[in-house]
Interface confidence: low
Amino acid sequence: AQEVQQSPHCTTVPVGASVNITCSTSGGLRGIYLRQLGPQPQDIIYYEDGVVPTTDRRFRGRIDFSGSQDNLTITMHRLQLSDTGTYTCQAITEVNVYGSGTLVLVTEEQSQGWHRCSDAPPRASALPAPPTGSALPDPQTASALPDPPAASALP
């Protein structure tokens, strides 16, 4: 069965710094979402090989990609306290598959010692499917991620 390997499980970074999240699969997917979990799950990016990536307004200009959709590293730059949260990779296949999640704790530099990651992964890898489509974030953050290009419309 298709799986998404996601790393790291948890990372603590100071405000203004960057974080790398890697999503690896065994291939055979249509594209990949990075989704911020929460009561209103928010799609941060949609990445598909050969297509201009779609990035949520809140992260526009702060996201870099390296690798391919099968082994994608997403770098989020200039992190803000409001970026704290759990990010999960969602591989678009016949059956959507989720990574185990990355908990990103954004701290002030001087208080970094007061924030600590636990050893356990943030979530079990069997995540419930979030609502279909691009969930709306809280109004303070951004508008919903635009749909991916029509050529790669989701089933």
Epitope: C10, V15, Q36, L37, G38, P39, Q80, L81, S82, D83, T84, G85, T86, L103, L105, V106, T107, E108, S111, W114, H115, R116, C117, S118, A120, P121, P122, R123, D138, P139, Q140
Partner: antibody, heavy 119, light 107 residues
């Protein structure tokens, strides 16, 4: 609906440790959110103490230096505050509260428990 | 730490009046301010989040505005049940901090 309830001793002696429990009903503390401790001093000043997230990650107010620890018991759906080497300055009403990670508005609060530090 | 100041310390109003509470931050915090109401012998209750976002179950007479360093909570027609202390809280910088509060009382 989520409900939070604090419990613990109402009187603690100086230099001892203060230990409080927040029992959460209506929601699993391992499912989502940050679970916070806040205190309110006589005179009503509010101070955020720290949180434990659904995953067990923690963050503390640096003003409490190394005196504070927030832990949890997932089997009982409880999280705990321990404050060491207390002084009379730690006399306050202690609240537990829930917030969304990265959002930090406290949308559910417990009823509070009063703690007096006195010999 | 970000310091929040609230003014005035006490507001005296008559029922039906419009009232405004002020919260000022020691540095620009965007819209990362939240407002709470605390009645006597009760816990704080979230009224407004992120300066102006309404909260389910909170009467529509409560509204918020502002960005940067200056924020306002308004009650457009005060009712007797609104007599309470009102606090602002910032969430842009660790540690999270609260204002000292404004007490609303009846004339």
């Amino acid at each position: 609906d989520v409900q939070l309830q604090e419990s613990g001793p109402g009187l603690v002696k100086p230099s001892q440790s203060l230990s409080l429990t927040c029992t959460v009903t209506g929601y699993s503390i391992t499912s989502d959110y940050a679970w916070n401790w806040i205190r309110q001093f006589p005179g009503n000043k509010l101070e955020w103490l720290g949180y434990i997230s659904y995953s067990g990650s923690t963050s503390y107010n640096p003003s409490l230096k190394s005196r504070i620890s927030i832990t949890r018991d997932t089997s009982k759906n409880q999280f705990f505050l321990q404050l060491n080497s207390v002084t009379t300055e730690d006399t306050a009403t202690y609240y537990c509260a829930k917030s969304q990670l990265g959002r930090w508005a406290m949308d559910y609060w417990g009823q509070g428990t009063s703690v007096t530090v006195s010999s | 730490d970000i310091l929040l100041t609230q003014s005035p310390a006490i507001l005296s109003v008559s029922p039906g009046e419009r009232v405004s509470f002020s919260c000022r931050a020691s540095q620009s915090i965007g819209t990362s301010i939240h407002w709470y109401q605390q009645r006597t012998n009760d816990s704080p209750r979230l009224l407004i989040k992120y300066a102006s976002e309404s909260i389910s179950g909170i009467p529509s007479r409560f509204s918020g505005s502002g960005s940067g360093t200056d924020f306002t909570l308004n009650i457009n027609s005060v009712e007797s049940e609104d007599i309470a202390d009102y606090y602002c809280q910032q969430s842009i910088s660790w540690p999270l901090t609260f204002g000292p509060g404004t007490k609303l009382e009846l004339k």
